[in-house]
């Protein structure tokens, strides 16, 4: 069971300092941006991180949403990352959900975050280069010191 708590607005970056944004095709991508680029591209660079109370504590349970015309929420259904047009729900009556991730700091680095899927144990949000694009993907990872699964989260509130 997950019960919604508060939400915050955040900019998410990979460890190469590229900014996560949602492109016109609703794809989550990373790109080099100056602070002014980041502001100019809002709201596509501003993510709503909603925190949830978890009936079996496993870290900070969160959803990641973005509000452009409508609110879309990050999902890892079938291990594929996509934004689905939906509001983060107030309650989820299950111990797993395709839209819930566990946000945890990397040990010894409070500013570096990992996001593990609640649906797929050992699968993490990751940045992966595909041709010329840096994509947000779900990655099965047993190399927990891999920088591709680490992010910084900067609160914009």
């Amino acid at each position: 069971y997950f019960g919604k708590l508060e939400s915050k607005l955040s900019v998410i970056r990979n460890l190469n300092d590229q900014v996560l944004f949602i492109d016109q095709g609703n794809r989550p991508l990373f790109e080099d941006m100056t602070d002014s680029d980041c502001r100019d591209n809002a709201p596509r660079t501003i993510f709503i991180i909603s925190m949830y109370k978890d009936s079996q504590p496993r870290g900070m349970a969160v959803t990641i949403s973005v509000k452009c015309e409508k609110i879309s929420t990050l999902s890892c259904e079938n291990k594929i990352i996509s934004f689905k047009e939906m509001n983060p729900p107030d309650n989820i009556k299950d111990t797993k959900s395709d839209i819930i991730f566990f946000q945890r700091s990397v040990p010894g680095h409070d500013n570096k975050m990992q996001f593990e899927s609640s649906s797929y144990e050992g699968y993490f949000l990751a940045c992966e280069k595909e041709r010329d694009l840096f994509k947000l993907i779900l990655k099965k990872e047993d190399e927990l010191g891999d920088r591709s699964i680490m992010f910084t989260v900067q609160n914009e509130d």
């Epitope: 870290g59 990397v106 040990p107 047993d142 190399e143 010191g145």
Partner: antibody, heavy 126, light 107 residues
């Protein structure tokens, strides 16, 4: 309690290949990997590589990548490690081990080699 | 590759003594470090994971500490059955690398 049972000792000639098996007995959850570690007589532990039974993807140590093949048969819960072009320096005890997530009180994951096979002595001698 | 430098390579101590073994990583391994004990002719056994978390069934005289690149295994009051070889392992990045090992002997 998970147990790993390995195949018996082998004596091989230089240039030959050896295939060591590792069978899982007992209840094991999903989301584990098989790793192989070797130990030459009187020496330390050396990581050789790992296989993911879910998709058969492998990662090998650079020094073995041209000679080692790790495979897994999900139907029998058995992992295999084949080492080719054997030389005398490959004389060692070869261990299989499971690599699984352990968690701290906040749910943070740590991968751990928890269950180990009894080891298989491979002797390479002409 | 991440190098793990373990010291000392051997130590001789008496029952009741406090023994410390250290491992130095060539880069930050984010506490993804485990400690193993190995008795002659046997497979290694897990003692500590996540740098400081005691594996179930391991006596509380064993403890681990450290972060970043520096890690320590401490045996607070040495017992005869603690004789054996001890290894650290970094699990942060592939290739996984072990320390060279520490041979612990009871005087």
């Amino acid at each position: 309690q998970v147990q790993l049972v390995q195949s018996g000792a082998e004596v091989k000639k230089p240039g030959a290949s050896v295939k060591v098996s590792c069978k899982v007995s007992g209840e094991i959850s999903t989301g584990y990997y098989f790793h192989w570690v070797r130990q030459a007589p009187g020496k330390g532990l050396e990581w050789m590589g790992r296989i993911d039974p879910e998709d058969d993807s492998t990662k090998y140590a650079e020094r073995f990548k041209d000679r080692v093949t790790m495979t897994e048969d999900t139907s029998t819960d058995t992992a295999y490690m084949e080492l080719s072009s054997l030389r005398s320096e490959d004389t060692a005890v070869y261990y299989c081990t499971t690599w699984r997530i352990y968690r701290d009180s906040s749910g943070r994951p740590f991968y751990v080699m928890d269950a180990w096979g009894q080891g298989t002595l491979v002797t390479v001698s002409s | 590759d991440i190098q793990m430098t373990q010291s000392p390579s051997s130590v001789s101590a008496s029952v009741g003594d406090r023994v410390t073994i250290t491992c130095l990583a060539s880069e930050d391994i984010y506490t993804y470090l485990t400690w193993y004990q190995q008795k002659p002719g046997k497979a290694p056994q897990l003692l500590i994971y996540g740098a400081n978390k005691l594996q179930d069934g391991v006596p509380s005289r064993f403890s681990g500490s450290g972060s970043g690149t520096d890690y320590t295994l401490t045996i607070s009051s040495l017992q005869p059955e603690d004789e054996g070889d001890y290894y650290c392992l970094q699990g942060s990045k592939f290739p996984l690398t072990f320390g060279q090992g520490t041979k612990l002997e009871i005087k």
